[in-house]
Interface confidence: low
């Protein structure tokens, strides 16, 4: 299938559906959006790479999201701009299919990454004592890989091989669209899988997160708390260290485990705590018990000299629990926005009903270490967490809904939607990739500072920026 055109029909003036000034405007706007998307997502990726304080599990999810969004900024946005401005697809069917496959796979991977982040937050808030243990780098890597593989399986084979499945390519030269979209059932199916289902899941998760946060805030207000020496407003963390050989105390009675050396806490075998970096905002609000554990890792925190390392005695019985409790006040560096927090670490081994026992122990210690109610500022940090997630969810819905609504309308009435409206709807999906770095990264003080250092070329000590 070759192009057959009248004399000079290949010239932009003849083929473009837009006037010259419109073409200039479209190129400027689209080019700027592409540039902002590229810069924003490169900044996120480089920040995570160069700053060791940003190398946390939740930021690995952000890194994956930034990869997807960067590809959209580099390829998808610019090729779609070219297609829109010229008025036809000039690069042939092979490049067309490759572009479509890349576009849809990566856009869907971006959505899947948003889903992972939502699930991660949901489990952090609803299972603060058990989930952080499972939340390892390996598990994060598996979840990220699953997001990409699932997106690839959902879109790439159908886009690339549909013409061979049905035995004919119905996409004309000079055009570039997904051939199987002429099938209404497939259109509905993919729209549900790629947008409607993720939106429903993310909305349900957000509802649970906000409900958990609200109920915790209420509990915090009601619950009477025991007095404690005035250290500072404290955020209590409960972390259960699941059995693995590294977690077992080296000495027989386990009393020496997790002692403080030179005022510093030794690194745990546990991955960093379960809060998204972007919640570490520029304020010193305290939060309620195990609302969301601090995002700071042990190597980011200076331990107070007076930190106590205690242990619960344990029997030598094979089925019994071996449990060490460490209570310590973690004092963040002055430029950190995370409230000072008390750590309660429950280091366990094997045995039945282990989690329940450990949770009870942790809860008792939590009550012991809580501040008097009158000294505690209102727990607004949880509201910030919820607000961040709401912003992310709304950004996703606002940018993706128009296109996906049009897709469904189009199934019944193809000419109903003007081409300009269609193009804007398609572009809005891309704009989600521009917004994502702002939504996530800019809510995090460490990210902000690292961005600033990178943009101002201040590379000295950038790896330790907090």
């Amino acid at each position: 299938m070759n192009n057959s055109t009248n004399s000079s029909n290949n010239s932009l003036a003849l083929t473009s559906p837009y006037k010259t000034f419109e073409v200039v405007f479209i190129v400027l706007v689209a080019g700027s959006l592409s540039l902002v998307t590229i810069i924003g997502n490169i900044l996120v990726m480089v920040s995570i790479k160069v700053n060791r304080h940003l190398q946390t599990v939740n930021n690995y999810f952000l890194f994956s999201l930034a990869c997807a969004d960067l590809i959209i900024g580099v390829f998808s946005m610019n090729l779609y701009t070219l297609y829109t401005v010229i008025g036809y697809w000039p690069l042939g069917p092979v490049v067309c299919d490759l572009w479509l496959a890349l576009d849809y796979v990566v856009s869907n991977a971006s959505v899947m990454n948003l889903l992972i982040i939502s699930f991660d937050r949901y489990f952090c808030v609803t299972k603060p004592l058990t989930y952080p243990v499972k939340r390892t780098t390996k598990m994060a890597g598996m979840m990220i890989a699953a997001a990409w593989v699932l997106s690839f399986i959902l879109w790439a084979p159908a886009i690339l091989f549909w013409q061979f499945i049905v035995g004919v390519r119905t996409v004309e030269d000079g055009e570039c669209y997904i051939q199987f979209f002429s099938n209404a059932a497939v259109t509905f199916g993919t729209a549900i899988a790629a947008f409607y289902l993720p939106v429903i899941i993310m909305t349900v998760l957000y509802w649970h997160i906000s409900r958990a946060s609200k109920s915790r805030i209420k509990k915090d207000k009601k619950e009477p708390v025991a007095n404690q020496d005035p250290v500072s407003p404290s955020l209590v963390q409960g972390r259960i260290v699941k059995p693995n050989n590294n977690n077992m105390p080296s000495s027989d009675d386990g009393l020496e485990h997790n002692k403080i050396q030179n005022g510093k806490a030794p690194r745990d075998p546990v991955t960093e705590n379960c809060v998204q970096g972007e919640e570490k905002e520029s304020s010193n609000d305290s939060t309620s018990v195990s609302a969301v554990a601090s995002n700071m890792r042990d190597d980011e925190i200076t331990q107070d000299e007076n930190t106590v390392s205690t242990s619960l005695g344990h029997s030598k019985d094979e089925n019994s629990k071996q449990t060490c409790i460490r209570i310590g006040t973690k004092t963040p560096k002055s430029d950190s926005c995370t409230p000072t927090n008390t750590t309660v670490e429950v280091v366990g081994s094997s045995g039945q009903n282990g989690d329940e026992k450990q949770n009870i122990v942790a809860r008792k210690i939590v009550k012991m270490t809580k501040q008097p109610a009158k000294k505690k500022p209102p727990p607004s940090r949880e509201k910030k967490v919820t607000r961040t997630i709401l912003a992310i969810l709304l950004a996703f819905i606002i940018t993706w809904a128009p296109y996906n609504v049009m897709v469904l309308i189009n199934t019944f009435c193809a000419p109903c939607i003007p081409n300009t409206v269609w193009t804007i709807g398609y572009w809005l999906c891309y704009i989600n990739s521009t917004i994502n770095p702002a939504c996530y990264a800019l809510c995090n003080a460490t990210f902000k500072k690292t961005f600033k250092h990178l943009l101002m070329c201040h590379y000295k000590n950038i790896g330790a920026t907090r």
Epitope: T5, S16, F181, S182, L408, N410
Partner: nanobody, 115 residues
Amino acid sequence: QVQLQESGGGLVQPGGSLRLSCAASGSIANLNSVGWYRQAPGKEREWVAAILAGGFATYADSVKGRFTISRDNAKNTVYLQMNSLKLEDTAVYYCNTPDRPGASWGQGTQVTVSS
């Protein structure tokens, strides 16, 4: 709501000509592309020709040099001029805006080439 309606089909002898029209109930200026498709009995629907907003015309190899597509935005109509018709051109011809997902299909117009 813009609806597309095909017309101009009929019975013609091999080597003969027909002109198909695709009339829109609203403006076609906003449609990036309008294409003609055909479906022969027992076969998959195949693309025949398309014309983009700026007048860029493109054709399937099987009809190149014999068919001509044009659009008249003032009349909101797209035409397919078919010359040197062959027996294998017998099919139901449809017009559509194929650059959108889930394009719905009209009734089409029957073209029969028979000696």
